[in-house]
Amino acid sequence: NQDLPVIKCVLINHKNNDSSVGKSSSYPMVSESPEDLGCALRPQSSGTVYEAAAVEVDVSASITLQVLVDAPGNISCLWVFKHSSLNCQPHFDLQNRGVVSMVILKMTETQAGEYLLFIQSEATNYTILFTVSIRNTLLYTLRRPYFRKMENQDALVCISESVPEPIVEWVLCDSQGESCKEESPAVVKKEEKVLHELFGTDIRCCARNELGRECTRLFTIDLNQTPQTTLPQLFLKVGEPLWIRCKAVHVNHGFGLTWELENKALEEGNYFEMSTYSTNRTMIRILFAFVSSVARNDTGYYTCSSSKHPSQSALVTIVEKGFINATNSSEDYEIDQYEEFCFSVRFKAYPQIRCTWTFSRKSFPCEQKGLDNGYSISKFCNHKHQPGEYIFHAENDDAQFTKMFTLNIRRKPQVLAEASASQASCFSDGYPLPSWTWKKCSDKSPNCTEEITEGVWNRKANRKVFGQWVSSSTLNMSEAIKGFLVKCCAYNSLGTSCETILLNSPGPFPFIQDNIS
């Protein structure tokens, strides 16, 4: 039909973006690239009805349903959702297309359903139907990938039993150390399940779906590398597959590799060998040790020996249940305002943990780095010198771990005073928490040197009053000081600040501010 307009239906996903630590929070919206919902004419329907592809949205996600209309002249429109009419404001883009949008902020169950858009143009009337549902992520899983040998081939298959079906990729690197970081140019990614090139330095398999990304590294002993100072350790849970690769390079083919478990040769069917010549005509051999489903008795020292290289071992520990080992005692730190400082947690865990750092009810990404001694470390440096409690939380399939840190920033106290009919109070946010003195100013003591000790009540670390650590001191008013100026001073190792208040009862209380370094 020549009169029908050209229309395009798109979905714009928004992500909540907030990266700054702060005293409070608001979340500016950031748009993702639009996804075409391919509006198609609905057959056998009365009138012209276009139907967009069904839209599945995560709970609390924010989206925009958008229609682009390529039709001459003005258009008018109306949204209908659950029998209610919703306001519709079309506008025109740079290509002079009519644009109609419906923004759904923080998706909830009540916002799921059919959204009907009625459009009236100079040429024709038509309806566009969007069906929006909440994605059922309760059934979603993302499992760490594991390896299997491909039947009758020298190749590894990477398997991740996840829902929805994950995208599996091999991440390969032929350099050493730091240059094998994820975004390094030395890293090659192959989006396939089967890998034939098994001679690389570093081989990982990763699986990703809507829940994120999980990776497994092929545990490797390289006989040409100097052994680590501590024995490499590999943890596995009962029933998981074991894969260890032993790799060696020699000037010619005249060498062989063998695997032993606790000085006994591995049984036939628990290893396979591959070899190739490298570019400089040296021979590379690899020997895989594998057990398709480990039991407790597979624990022990696995040693790879060569007729031309010193042998190297790894300790394989089979556990019934995953674990996270780290000291969970809380730690307090005290730093200067511009001192560089990072929190850090050292832990040993299996399976690999997922972790977050939290401050002031806001979570921050957590990076972990493996150390040579089998431990991992996570650091958090993005505290922006804000005092308070920081929480490290880690979990894996079987264990959870939480560690608390307190950060105090050394600073000279500030003082803020207030007075009521019966008392005067002073507050300070200095750290170390300050000590207090009260002095009476009179004719006899114009410099306010007469110390007041009666009726003073100090409170340490009352964090209520200003949403941060605050020390306070209260002076109960007595007849002896009514009508006088009094001075409260807070002092710590970094300095002193004072504020002077007139104890005038009843009525308002003026003040004079002093500052003494």
């Epitope: 500030q414 946010d429 009053v465």
Partner: antibody
Framework: QVQLVQSGAEVKKPGASVKVSCKAS????????ISWVRQAPGQGLEWMGW????????NYAQKFQGRVTMTRDTSTSTVYMELSSLRSEDTAVYYC???????????WGQGTLVTVSS | DIQMTQSPSSLSASVGDRVTITCRAS??????VNWYQQKPGKAPKLLIY???SLQSGVPSRFSGSGSGTDFTLTISSLQPEDFATYYC?????????FGQGTKLEIK
């Protein structure tokens, strides 16, 4: 979310008093001080004083001493600022602001315009 | 009272420009300086507290520096929504005092 909602605009005659309210929500009312800051038309910001909603204690800027009274009602999470003996130079927008630190103002009310005119 | 003097009092700039506003205190105030943005008919909004700490939700193009008596607010790449009046404020001692403001206009 944190909100400070102020009462509506007022027109007063010189010598009269005005009482502006500021209702707090979205946080623990007694945990943060409330300051009042005013802004005359086309001018800068001027601090008037603060109240501790926990104790009701106050501290006023010298300039407003004797003319300003700040009170609070913890049952409704509302702070009040009363300014007496009004003169034409008191024509301004009056803001209440939450004290996120001892003297930093992290959330502000929308402002109340007080016009003093004979 | 501590006087806070801002400069310039107004400035014209274009989207994408890097802009710096300075504030000088009449006495040393350590790092107790806050910066606010105010748009016509609206309440001020806290951008930066304690000289350099970015208030939550404020874009990272805003930054602050300084100590003692001299402080700066920098906007690394001006956006259309940044055209407004900016105020510095000392939170060192009572009474807290504000600068006279810097009006940032579109060139």
């Amino acid at each position: 979310q944190v909100q400070l909602v102020q009462s509506g605009a007022e027109v007063k005659k010189p010598g009269a008093s005005v009482k502006v309210s500021c209702k707090a929500s979205g946080y623990t009312f007694t945990s943060y001080g409330i300051s009042w800051v005013r802004q005359a038309p086309g001018q800068g910001l001027e601090w008037m004083g603060w109240i501790n909603p926990n104790s009701g204690g106050t501290n006023y800027a010298q300039k407003f001493q004797g003319r300003v009274t700040m009170t609070r009602d913890t049952s409704t999470s509302t702070v009040y600022m009363e300014l007496s003996s009004l003169r034409s130079e008191d024509t301004a927008v009056y803001y209440c602001a939450r004290q996120g630190g001892l003297r930093d103002f992290d959330y502000w009310g929308q402002g109340t315009l007080v016009t003093v005119s004979s | 009272d501590i006087q806070m003097t801002q400069s310039p009092s107004s400035l014209s700039a274009s989207v994408g420009d890097r802009v710096t506003i300075t504030c000088r205190a009449s006495q040393s105030i350590s790092t107790y300086v806050n910066w606010y943005q105010q748009k016509p008919g609206k309440a001020p909004k806290l951008l930066i507290y304690d000289t350099s700490s970015l208030q939550s939700g404020v874009p990272s193009r805003f930054s602050g520096s300084g100590s003692g008596t001299d402080f700066t607010l920098t906007i690394s790449s001006l956006q259309p929504e940044d055209f407004a009046t900016y105020y510095c404020q000392q939170s060192f001692i009572t009474p807290p005092t504000f600068g006279q403001g810097t009006k940032l206009e579109i060139k």
